[in-house]
Amino acid sequence: RSLQDTEEKSRSFSASQADPLSDPDQMNEDKRHSQGTFTSDYSKYLDSRRAQDFVQWLMNTKRNRNNIAKRHDEFERHAEGTFTSDVSSYLEGQAAKEFIAWLVKGRGRRDFPEEVAIVEELGRRHADGSFSDEMNTILDNLAARDFINWLIQTKITDRK
């Protein structure tokens, strides 16, 4: 089964779910899933949709920041110089770290060694000023294309 029209889907940014039909096993799904001992088809589906959403959110954040910077560069610098863009970069970095951490939670670090290492390295480099460019490159070239596609394809094929 192919990806859900990923490019077209990226126009939107999603959210919605419902109540289990009084299934006692379902009640413990989240707990077991977070412990890494149980993953339902539905959980895999949620993972793949959140991955798409996360990339879209990051792209939108980057796009919005770049547009603002182009139009209002002098206002964006703030009194401290690069305050706004630094905060945006920091927030993107935090989001990326949290999301990757969430993805690997319950699966083990060895399942995503490259991605975890990259995110940790980005965190270490934030202070030296090279973080933003690297983050954008990683997101555009690795997360959005290779990692997320691999993640979604894997989950969809696993589901069968």
């Epitope: 029209d5 779910q17 949620l46």
Partner: antibody, heavy 115, light 107 residues
């Protein structure tokens, strides 16, 4: 066990505001979308908006943008929805529901706008 | 906005009959369509997600199919407890939208 707790009912006067709550438990609050859905008596479902606590994102249905304000309190794992300038059209059951396909629903809060 | 149109608005069935409910999207909704069951005075319950995937604990007499603009919920052998309203909903693009519902009644 996943639970979305909502107060049962609110009686409010026309023109007033009301703040509805949806307290989540039994899962990691930051990791899931929470949606708000309106259902008028004998009518269908309408999506109002949603929030993703972990990313600090809030989305609104344009139809409800001037009526509704969503806020999130991560410390209490609660999402709030404030309805303003209430009229009889706002009398409805308001549900909160979790994530893309609303796999978990609260019991709903019945809002009655009456003088 | 994607408009979801359900048909029929209501239908009367006998126990054991096969029921087919349809939902038509005004534009492409991919497979991001779900089906819900709502009984009187209860919250809705998820039956089908991602177009055709039965949610955990849902009896296998419920089957979803379709993609893009045409979606179907089939109940292979309707039971008395299936008396309810049924809604489709899309989460492909904002704002998410629901169909107007189909009321399933028993003869």
């Amino acid at each position: 066990q996943v639970q979305l707790l909502q107060p049962g009912a609110e009686l409010v006067k026309p023109g007033a505001s009301v703040k509805l709550s949806c307290k989540a438990s039994g899962y990691n609050f930051n990791d899931y979308w929470l949606n708000w859905v309106k259902q008028r008596p004998g009518q269908g479902l309408e999506w109002i908006g949603n929030a993703y606590p972990g990313w600090g994102i809030i989305n609104y249905n344009e139809k409800f943008k001037s009526k509704v304000t969503l806020t999130v309190d991560t410390s209490s794992s609660t999402v709030y929805m404030q309805l303003s300038s209430l009229t009889s059209d706002d009398s409805a059951v308001y549900y909160c529901a979790r994530d893309y396909d609303n796999a978990y629903w609260g019991q709903g809060t019945t809002v009655t706008v009456s003088s | 906005n994607i408009v979801m149109t359900q048909s029929p608005k209501s239908m009367s069935m006998s126990v054991g009959e096969r029921v087919t409910l349809t939902c038509k999207a005004s534009e492409n909704a991919g497979t991001y369509v779900a089906w819900y069951q709502q009984k009187p005075e209860q919250s809705p319950k998820l039956l089908i997600y991602n177009g055709s995937h039965r949610y955990d604990g849902v009896p296998d007499r419920f089957t979803g199919s379709g993609s893009a603009t045409d979606f179907t919920l089939t109940i292979s052998s309707v039971q008395a407890e299936d008396l309810a309203d049924y809604y489709c909903g899309q989460s492909y693009s904002y704002p998410w939208t629901f169909g107007g519902g189909t009321k399933l009644e028993m003869k």
